[in-house]
């Protein structure tokens, strides 16, 4: 029977760790990490990492017992667990009776958003105590909401990330710009800024409607020449609160007509903010 | 039946190359890795190298890492051994050879002569 | 790289006889141990592998024993198609290396 791997929690240094080894096995020949997805009884999905690693084909596989890997996070906390993989066979052949390296994978570090991971392996027997023992190590940093597989979990989504603005701003004169913009049921207080360098102009929107999808205009007060300017949108949701994703547009001249400026010049982009 | 049959014997002049050929039947070639070794006259053996030819992974001995090249083939499973730069000292024997578990040499080619005079 | 120590380099013996050939190696290599019988103008035959155990076809009057550095393949009663020179090759991880062989000639 070919080997497989059976994984549980290991926290703590393994038991290995306290004898003396005369030979350890070799060293992992690859590690790599990638994001996959899977659904949650709630509706949601939860984002994990699929570790996969290579083992080295010589005679020192036969040692093998078990690989360990450890990931440590670092975002607003830090976060840092371990996963011990045994082998269910000892190794009878260096490669795979079909061929290519014996290669295994681990689904089940939980990906949060946004955060930096550090991903290390080394094999079990290993090394003995005051003893550098081979390890392998990759950093996997994980997409915020802007990324469209990230995008569409609750927190996302509650944080706006499919909330589209659709802004559109004209200067109307050299001392106003007017700005309109979609609101969403998420939340009823926005920040509008204009930029050109730096801030010309700013305003607090408050839209009581909340429930509602409505289209909001404000006229802002300038300093300085807004034509080609920056606005950004900032929503304040319960959820994120000044943290939300932030949406841009450009400042157009208004056109002459009743129309207060034009539709299709939509400069809407997704902002920075990766929650 | 496991089979490995090597090109015919060569003469080549000093500073020349040679590369030899080793044909598989009877396994799947991809499984096992392909070791060469090469034997002087009247000497020992002596490992050179060898190739995954699944992924084309390479090991050398450094003693041949500079002058030795091991390829592959899988459509026709052949494995190849080229030596460059050919010295006097490079006249030997040069064998193929292969295992289905770990580095065992089970199987060996037939052996190519490689002669190298000037 | 792994050095291999063969002992004797050559030795004479007659139909019958046990002959025993030793192997040294320099370092641990956990019975990753090979030993081949090669005649003249052929390729070398595997004997026995892990040390241990036997290859397919070799008849049980060959057996191989050792452990750690110190290996022995031993010949319970010489046959006339046992004369040939006998080679020990390790397999722990490469570089690989091979024993300077041993000749087993008919006194």
């Known amino acids: 029977r070919e080997p497989t791997v059976q994984c549980g929690s290991e926290t703590g240094p393994s038991p290995e760790w306290m004898l003396q080894h005369d030979l350890i096995p070799g060293d992992l020949r690859d590690l790599r990490v990638e994001p996959v997805t899977t659904s949650v009884a709630t509706g949601d999905y939860s984002i994990l990492m699929n570790v996969s690693w290579v083992l080295r084909a010589d005679a020192s596989i036969r040692l093998l017992k078990a690989t360990k890997i450890c990931v440590t996070g670092k975002s607003n906390f830090q976060s840092y667990s371990c996963v011990r993989c045994n082998y269910t066979e000892a190794f009878q052949t260096q490669t795979r009776p079909s061929g290519g390296k014996w290669t295994f994978s681990y689904i089940g570090f939980p990906v949060e958003l946004n955060t930096v991971y550090f991903i290390g392996a080394h094999n079990i027997p290993n090394a003995n105590m005051n003893e550098d023992g081979p390890s392998m190590s990759v950093n996997f940093t994980s997409p915020g909401c802007l990324d469209h597989i990230m995008k569409y979990k609750k927190k996302c989504v509650k944080a706006g990330s499919l909330w589209d603005p659709n802004i559109t701003a004209c200067k109307k004169n050299e001392e106003t710009v007017e700005v309109n913009f979609t609101t969403t049921p998420l939340g009823n207080r926005y920040m509008a800024l204009i930029q050109h360098s730096t801030i010309i102009g700013f305003s607090q929107v408050f839209e009581p409607h909340q429930k509602k999808q409505t289209r909001a205009s404000v006229v802002i007060p300038v300093t300085g020449d807004s034509e080609g300017a920056t606005v950004q949108l900032t929503p304040y949701f319960p959820t994120c609160g000044s943290d939300c994703i932030r949406h841009k547009g450009t400042v157009v001249l208004c056109p002459q007509t009743g129309v207060p400026f034009p539709l299709d010049n939509n400069k809407s982009k997704p902002g920075g903010w990766l929650p | 039946e496991v089979q490995l049959v090597q090109s015919g014997a060569e003469v080549k002049k000093p500073g020349a190359s040679v590369k030899v050929s080793c044909k598989t039947s009877g396994y799947t070639f991809i499984s096992y890795w392909m070791n060469w070794v090469r034997q002087a006259p009247g000497q020992g053996l002596e490992w050179m190298g060898r190739?995954?030819?699944?992924?084309?992974?390479?090991q050398y001995n450094q003693k041949f890492k500079d002058r030795a090249t091991l390829t592959r083939d899988t459509s026709i499973s052949t494995a190849y051994m080229e030596l460059s730069r050919l010295r006097s000292d490079d006249t030997a024997v040069y064998y193929c050879?292969?295992?289905?578990?770990?580095?065992?040499?089970?199987?060996w080619g037939q052996g190519t002569l490689v002669t190298v005079s000037s | 790289d792994i050095q291999m120590t063969q002992s004797p380099s050559s030795l004479s013996a007659s139909v019958g006889d046990r002959v025993t050939i030793t192997c040294r190696t320099s370092e641990n290599i956990y019975s990753n141990l090979a030993w081949y019988q090669q005649k003249p103008g052929k390729a070398p035959k595997l004997l026995l592998y892990?040390?241990?155990n036997l290859g397919d076809g070799v008849p049980s009057r060959f057996s191989g024993s050792g452990s750690g550095t110190d290996y022995t393949l031993t010949i319970s009663s010489l046959q006339p198609e046992d004369f040939a020179t006998y080679y020990c090759?390790?397999?722990?991880?490469?570089?690989?290396?091979f024993g300077g062989g041993t000749k087993v000639e008919i006194k």
């Open positions: 892990d040390a241990t």
């Open positions: 190739i995954d030819p699944y992924d084309s992974e390479i």
């Open positions: 090759q390790h397999f722990w991880g490469p570089p690989y290396t």
């Open positions: 050879a292969t295992s289905g578990g770990f580095d065992w040499f089970a199987y």
